[in-house]
Interface confidence: low
């Protein structure tokens, strides 16, 4: 997948950091105190839609068949810009019955980024 | 997740079964003959941006709370109606060494819509 | 960069109270996202945590010492106190205070030199 | 109450590497965290987060964590290393020492 570097507009993966502070998450996530969480932008025209690499899921692959071959709807199915690899991070946080808890939280972080 | 009922146009999963014979996938697929692989359709209004339900990923959540304060650039960042549970099938097909095997295949079938 | 340094008395009577205060300089006590910490070391043996408190005063201790311990601080001084009464032979330690990192509860980074407290008639 | 338990001494020759542990039930569910205390000096964070080294503490020092044990592992061990090591974790909102473990480099 593509990073974003302010010369492209085709769908990249841009840098962005989350403050648990900011969000208020801060009374409940112990450990860390905020992480490179990162977002997918930019456009998806059609030649690249269902594009998204190494990530492409078995469903994204017949789909665009369909799609390529202008088999109605999916040859008008808007493509986005979306995370087609996520990471996990561990996480230390109060669970409902304010218990501490270490766990490896999945999706958490935008590895990749593709067109739908 | 919503069903596609013909009523909604908001973002929801829509029923399509695939045939591998349609797509040309049936010298190398053995079993099944085809399945419902099934796609997301529909709207995502400010609203409902980031409301993908049980599914609803950490990443998801994070960006969503960022997006319903405003935070440039998510404020403006384009929604999409995306899978966001896919479920794994089993298939039986031959591999580049023309061997049987078979694979529990991970992301064939969409099971839940919601937005980005 | 946080320093942080223990103050009292070295020798306290049994059946006393004990008192100390942390100061802490370089960074204020009132930061969110921290809490400050007392965690005592026997004589030859290890290390024993003892409780802490938020700059808003949420407080959390030892089960095993809860009953007799006390953790205040004063922001306007910058510091935090232990007080720790009934006291007996089995008090006499190294004291350290030292802050607890994360947005809450975390690891201890960074500690005091440690002062001595003898429990004795 | 929630135990962690150490060898209490640990010996290793200079050069060599150096293996500390900390068993507690389910220790892998928990982040470790590890403290170097050395004689009239503050107690030193040497990891955090089970295998994260704070600024200024050398690459040979790294740890892991998973089942019930926590490891410290100091590669190419130095005189200067010698020194009590204690792991630590949490308990719900109770915090749990090891009974530390004493490091002599021969």
């Known amino acids: 997948g593509l990073e974003c570097d302010g010369k492209v507009n085709i769908c990249c993966k841009k840098q962005f950091f989350v403050s648990f502070k900011d969000i208020g998450w801060n009374d409940w996530i112990i450990a860390p105190s905020g992480y490179h969480a990162n977002y997918c932008e930019g456009e998806c025209p059609s030649h690249i839609a269902g594009t998204s690499g190494s990530s492409l899921s078995f469903h994204s692959t017949v789909i665009n068949h369909y799609r390529m071959r202008g088999h109605s709807p999916f040859a008008n199915l808007k493509s986005c810009c979306i995370p087609t690899k996520l990471s996990t991070m561990s996480m230390l946080y109060f669970d409902d019955e304010y218990n501490i808890v270490k766990r490896d939280v999945p999706n958490m972080i935008v590895e990749e980024c593709g067109c739908s | 997740g919503l069903e596609c009922d013909g009523k909604v146009n908001i973002c929801c999963k829509k029923q399509f079964f695939v045939s591998f014979k349609d797509i040309g996938w049936n010298d190398w697929i053995i079993a099944p003959s085809g399945y419902h692989a099934n796609y997301c359709e529909g709207e995502c209004p400010s609203h409902i941006a980031g409301t993908s339900g049980s599914s609803l990923s950490f990443h998801s959540t994070v960006i969503n709370h960022y997006r319903m304060r405003g935070h440039s650039p998510f404020a403006n960042l384009k929604s999409c109606c995306i899978p966001t549970k896919l479920s794994t099938m089993s298939m039986l097909y031959f591999d580049d060494e023309y061997n049987i095997v078979k694979r529990d295949v991970p992301n064939m079938i969409v099971e839940e819509c919601g937005c980005s | 960069q946080v320093q942080l340094q223990e103050s009292g008395p070295g020798l306290v009577k049994p059946s006393q109270t004990l008192s100390l205060t942390c100061t802490v300089s370089?960074?204020?006590?009132?930061?969110?996202?921290?809490?400050w910490s007392w965690i005592r070391q026997h004589p030859g043996k290890g290390l024993e945590w003892i409780g802490y408190i938020s700059y808003s005063g949420s407080t959390y201790y030892n089960p095993s010492l809860k009953s007799r311990v006390t953790i205040s601080v004063d922001t306007s001084k910058n510091q935090f106190s232990l007080k720790l009464n009934s006291v007996t032979a089995a008090d006499t330690a190294v004291y350290y205070c030292?802050?607890?990192?994360?947005?809450?509860?975390?690891?201890?980074?960074?500690w005091g030199q440690g002062t001595l407290v003898t429990v004795s008639s | 109450s929630y135990e962690l338990t150490q060898p209490p001494s640990v010996s290793v020759s200079p050069g060599q590497t150096a293996s500390i542990t900390c068993s507690g039930d389910k220790l892998g569910d928990k982040f470790a965290f590890w403290y170097q205390l050395k004689p009239g000096q503050s107690p030193v964070l040497v990891i955090y987060?089970?295998?994260k080294r704070p600024s200024g503490i050398p690459e040979r020092f790294s740890g892991s964590n998973s089942g019930n044990t926590a490891t410290l592992t100091i590669s190419g061990t130095q005189a200067m290393d010698a020194a009590d090591f204690y792991c630590?974790?949490?308990?719900?909102?109770?915090?749990?020492f090891g009974g530390g473990t004493k490091l002599t480099v021969l």
């Open positions: 630590q974790a949490w308990d719900s909102s109770t915090v749990v």
């Open positions: 030292a802050r607890a990192y994360g947005d809450y509860r975390g690891w201890f980074d960074p």
């Open positions: 987060q089970d295998n």
């Open positions: 370089g960074g204020s006590i009132s930061s969110g996202g921290y809490y």
